[in-house]
């Protein structure tokens, strides 16, 4: 039962994580204009992996896709690639894990097959989570670098009479969504790997040991030696399938006011 719960929970956590990775990848707010000395702005800029947007205080928002792939910063391209790889691996992992779920009966699938599938999906979730975390971190690092470069430019260019407003960008909501989602996917993957250990088939090996006593010979056959990879020393016989199938509850024109003030 604990194995089924661990596997089921791992699946749900990974599912939420992958949904989060997809959401983060699609979100436009990867970087948002830093309102360092101007908490109320009439023009607010924010950027995603795929397009940049400008929201005017009048409520009108205009988004524009990036024109050239080659002209984009390498870090942005790396973040895109890592997020896509994370989504693809996560999606495959979800597909594999559905069939690996202990509560789902598929023909006469062996426990060993389910254990292998659980392990495979777990590893996929772990890699998927790491890809998402890496993608978000690469982008965040690019932002930090650009932020300090912009700050340096801001203070070196203040000698003239006419001030040019230097737009600095800081972490957007998508980064935090990505980090949390990547972490959840990673945790889900670890849980699947743990569940896999409990799903491995119980081999009962009878090893006969002969004891030669004086006068007569008695052969003792001790109780079955448990070859389970589970954590507990549970010696009860397990059913191949859990009782009933467990069901898990799975838990954006008019202009609009700017929400960045």
């Amino acid at each position: 039962m604990a194995v089924t719960a661990c596997q089921g929970l791992g699946f749900v956590v990974s599912l939420i994580g992958i949904a989060g990775i997809i959401a983060a990848t699609c979100m436009d707010q990867w970087s948002t204009q830093d309102l360092y000395n101007n908490p109320v702005t009439a023009v607010f800029n924010y950027q995603g992996l795929w397009r940049s947007c400008v929201r005017e205080s009048s409520g009108f928002t205009e988004c524009r896709g990036y024109d050239s792939l080659l002209a984009l910063p390498q870090d942005l391209q790396a973040a895109r690639a890592l997020m896509i790889v994370g989504i693809v691996l996560g999606a495959i992992g979800l597909l594999v894990s559905i069939f690996a779920l202990k509560c789902i009966r598929i023909g006469s699938m062996e426990d060993s097959a389910k254990a292998n599938m659980t392990l495979t999906s777990g590893i996929m979730f772990i890699v998927s989570g790491l890809c998402a975390i890496a993608g978000v971190s690469v982008f965040a690092n690019m932002l930090v670098t650009n932020f300090w470069m912009s700050t340096a430019n801001m203070y070196t260019g203040m000698g003239g009479m006419v001030q040019t407003v230097q737009t600095r960008y800081t972490f957007g909501a998508a980064l935090f969504v990505g980090w949390v989602a990547g972490g959840l996917t990673l945790i889900g993957g670890v849980m699947m790997c743990i569940a896999c250990r409990g799903l491995a088939p119980e081999e009962t090996n009878y090893k006969a040991v002969s004891y030669h006593a004086s006068g007569h010979s008695v052969a003792y056959k001790p109780g079955g030696f448990k070859a389970s990879t589970g954590f507990g020393s549970n010696t009860k016989n397990k059913k191949i399938y859990d009782g009933g199938a467990r069901t898990e509850d799975e838990v954006q024109s008019y202009p609009s006011k700017h929400d960045y003030v």
Epitope: A42, N45, S58, G59, K257
Partner: antibody, heavy 118, light 113 residues
Framework: QVQLQQPGAELVRPGASVKLSCKAS????????INWVKQRPGQGLEWIGN????????NYNQKFKDKATLTVDKSSSTAYMQLSSPTSEDSAVYYC???????????WGQGTTLTVSS | DIVMTQSPSSLTVTAGEKVTMSCKSS????????????LTWYQQKPGQPPKLLIY???TRESGVPDRFTGSGSGTDFTLTISSVQAEDLAVYYC?????????FGSGTKLEIK
């Protein structure tokens, strides 16, 4: 069509607060910012502040922060600007306007001429 | 606050002439996010409220005759009337729409001979 209706004139005694109105029609009132602009006789334009009718969020020009208070009544699609302790300096034409693309003001009321006199 | 400076303060022309008026801002009005200049031009005829002519420095509002053209970027902007008509007699104001508080220029008064 879009209209912003303002009373033509208001007379107020110095020190007695006054509430100017701006009734909007012909569009979804709660979806566009309402701005207030001051114009003294023979002078230029000054932006006082704006209000978002949907949630009454306001921005003020610091110069008018203690002078003007912007409010809205969504049920009657009317925006208000209350001027506290008016003096002769507050005698001017006050326009209400609607925000448009580029943060520009596409529709303007006819303006209320406020006279502060004893 | 961004200071808007308009020049000349007034100009007198004959009908059919080409007119240009200038507007300078103390800070750049160019937004890097969409490469648009947040400058607006208004026309105010005597006894009337201002009327929107041009926003984003060069985008003509619908219904505005095409003889009105806005140009410029950053801190220097120009409003050009290619062939002045008698009905163009008005005061023309430029406005900063880039940062709060929104500020207006002192205006350029156009008079017809």
């Amino acid at each position: 069509q879009v209209q912003l209706q303002q009373p033509g004139a208001e007379l107020v005694r110095p020190g007695a607060s006054v509430k100017l109105s701006c009734k909007a029609s012909g569009y979804t009132f709660t979806s566009y910012w309402i701005n207030w602009v001051k114009q003294r006789p023979g002078q230029g334009l000054e932006w006082i502040g704006n209000i978002y009718p949907s949630d009454s969020y306001t921005n003020y020009n610091q110069k008018f922060k203690d002078k003007a208070t912007l409010t809205v009544d969504k049920s009657s699609s009317t925006a208000y600007m209350q001027l506290s302790s008016p003096t002769s300096e507050d005698s001017a034409v006050y326009y209400c306007t609607r925000s448009w693309r580029g943060n520009s003001f596409d529709y303007w009321g006819q303006g209320t001429t406020l006279t502060v006199s004893s | 606050d961004i200071v808007m400076t308009q020049s000349p303060s007034s100009l007198t022309v004959t009908a059919g002439e080409k007119v240009t008026m200038s507007c300078k801002s103390s800070q750049s009005l160019l937004n890097s996010g969409n490469q648009k200049n947040y400058l607006t031009w208004y026309q105010q005829k005597p006894g009337q409220p201002p009327k929107l002519l041009i926003y984003w420095a060069s985008t003509r509002e619908s219904g505005v005759p095409d003889r009105f053209t806005g140009s410029g970027s950053g801190t220097d902007f120009t409003l050009t009337i290619s062939s002045v008509q008698a009905e163009d007699l008005a005061v023309y104001y430029c406005q900063n729409d880039y940062s709060y508080p929104f500020t207006f220029g002192s205006g350029t008064k156009l008079e017809i001979k």
